[in-house]
Interface confidence: low
């Protein structure tokens, strides 16, 4: 059964990065509005984005309650100007989303190199820890807090004067690498969850940062450019 002149939503798609999670769908509404419901496999449905003309709904607040749960959403279609009627027994058309498990499926956002510091022939490169909207005891958690050792960072580094890249990895947010004295190096990092096997295993590469520019500090030269 369906409600007159309404079309069921379709192409329900989860868009999620660092747990910021939005459900998108089609079509753009003509004379209809949507309401979204979300639940865990064993939980009750909770309604969100009531009677919206948008084709997206931010469900972050719901999924961050337990990022390891599996969620299902559904989008109901109502006639434009719909006012909930207690007398209506006809179920509006709706479409279910794919299942979504945030911990496994959220994309890793592009990381940022926070700073680098050279001491002799060693360089310490620090990756900025991104904050998420996941909370524990009313405190927002960082990406590292949520993923722990499941999250590693890969550092790509190369001499400014050459194209040969080297790599290092860490399961903290810091790298300590050996460099040749007197050479400038460039750096880029990538967030990785090795235990994932899907396309969302890796983030995009961070912007490239190079020694001799505004990001680092060198005890040899006395330049201090800390980025926060």
């Amino acid at each position: 059964s369906g409600t007159t002149n309404t079309v069921a939503a379709y192409n329900l798609t989860w868009k999620s990065t660092n747990f910021k999670t939005i459900l998108e769908w089609e079509p753009k509404p003509i004379n209809q509005v949507y309401t979204v419901q979300i639940s865990t496999k064993s939980g009750d449905w909770k309604s969100k984005c009531f009677y919206t003309a948008d084709t997206e709904c931010d469900l972050t607040d719901e999924i961050v309650k337990d990022v390891k749960q599996t969620y299902l959403a559904r989008v109901f279609s109502y006639p434009a100007g719909h006012v909930e009627s207690t007398g209506s027994t006809e179920e509006p058309p709706y479409e279910n989303s794919p299942e979504f498990t945030p911990y496994l499926e959220t994309n890793l956002g592009q990381p940022t190199i926070q700073s680098f510091e050279q001491v002799g022939t060693k360089v310490n490169v620090t990756v900025q820890d991104e904050w998420t909207l996941v909370r524990r005891n009313d405190t927002f958690l960082s990406l590292r807090d949520v993923f722990g050792k499941d999250l590693i960072y890969t550092l790509y580094y190369w001499k400014s004067s050459s194209s040969g890249k080297k790599t290092a990895k860490t399961n903290t947010n810091e790298f300590l690498i050996d460099v040749d004295k007197g050479e400038n190096y460039c750096f880029s990092v990538q967030a990785v969850i090795p235990s994932r096997r899907t396309a969302n295993r890796k983030s995009t590469d961070s912007p490239v940062e190079c020694m001799g520019h505004e990001k680092g500090e060198s005890r040899e030269t006395g330049h201090h450019h800390h980025h926060h």
Epitope: T101, L104, K149, I152, T167, P194, R197
Partner: antibody, heavy 124, light 108 residues
Framework: QVQLQQWGAGLLKPSETLSLTCAVY????????WSWIRQPPGKGLEWIGE???????RYNPSLKSRVTISVDTSKNQFSLKLSSVTAADTAVYYC??????????????????WGKGTTVTVSS | EIVLTQSPGTLSLSPGERATLSCRAS???????LAWYQQKPGQAPRLLIY???SRANGIPDRFSGSGSGTDFTLTISRLEPEDFAVYYC?????????FGGGTKVEIK
């Protein structure tokens, strides 16, 4: 050192459900995949499926309709259920840890820790 | 499904000889996902090589892996008595993960 200890019924009748459990000692479920593999008598190895610590599963399509792999992180163990068994399911069943390993720009997956195997016979 | 075909099915050699085992894939396999295992009667398989060419912990350097794409090779440079066993290649990049049919290395 991580060890896998597995157990379950060894003799089943056709149409029954095979149920095996594998306990992980000396290590965590987290960060790995956990696989089941079987080997019919005198034959080669067949991958049945795997589960991640968070519950994500992948199954061999040839068995998918009959297989359920689950994980119990509180007990540090994972389990295999195979429904509607026939004589063709007679095999030694192994559990194994499937390790994702990063080294110098590459990701490698390999089964580095195995259980000793459980012989399962299906016979009327 | 990626089919892995191992050859020869049986290799009869003497201790001290060199063993060359082949694994051919029906479709290209990322070498990161290609592994070799050794299995002795009544025992579980044991990881020898991962990533097509990296030796697992505790594996002697007489074992080496090579190859890429659809053709991979396990070489045992000098067979020791304990090396006589069945060897399987495996790909873990595409579901279903598949094993080759095995090569039995037996004493001549």
């Amino acid at each position: 050192q991580v060890q896998l200890q597995q157990w379950g019924a060894g003799l089943l009748k056709p149409s029954e459900t095979l149920s095996l459990t594998c306990a992980v000692y000396g290590g965590s479920l987290s960060g790995y995949y956990w696989s089941w593999i079987r080997q019919p008598p005198g034959k080669g190895l067949e991958w049945i499926g795997e589960i991640g610590a968070s519950g994500s599963t992948r199954y061999n399509p040839s068995l998918k309709s009959r297989v359920t792999i689950s994980v119990d992180t509180s007990k540090n163990q994972f389990s295999l259920k195979l429904s509607s068994v026939t004589a063709a399911d007679t095999a030694v069943y192994y559990c194994a840890r499937d390790t994702p390993y990063y080294y110098e720009g590459g990701y490698y997956y390999y089964m580095d820790v195995w259980g000793k195997g459980t012989t399962v016979t299906v016979s009327s | 499904e990626i089919v892995l075909t191992q050859s020869p099915g049986t290799l009869s050699l003497s201790p001290g000889e060199r063993a060359t085992l082949s694994c051919r894939a029906s479709d290209s396999v990322d070498s990161s996902y290609l592994a070799w295992y050794q299995q002795k009667p009544g025992q579980a398989p044991r990881l020898l090589i991962y990533g097509a060419f990296s030796r697992a912990n505790g594996i002697p350097d007489r074992f080496s892996g090579s190859g890429s794409g659809t053709d991979f090779t396990l070489t045992i440079s000098r067979l020791e008595p304990e090396d006589f066993a069945v060897y399987y290649c495996q790909q873990a990049g595409v579901v279903p993960y598949t094993f080759g049919g095995g090569t039995k290395v037996e004493i001549k």
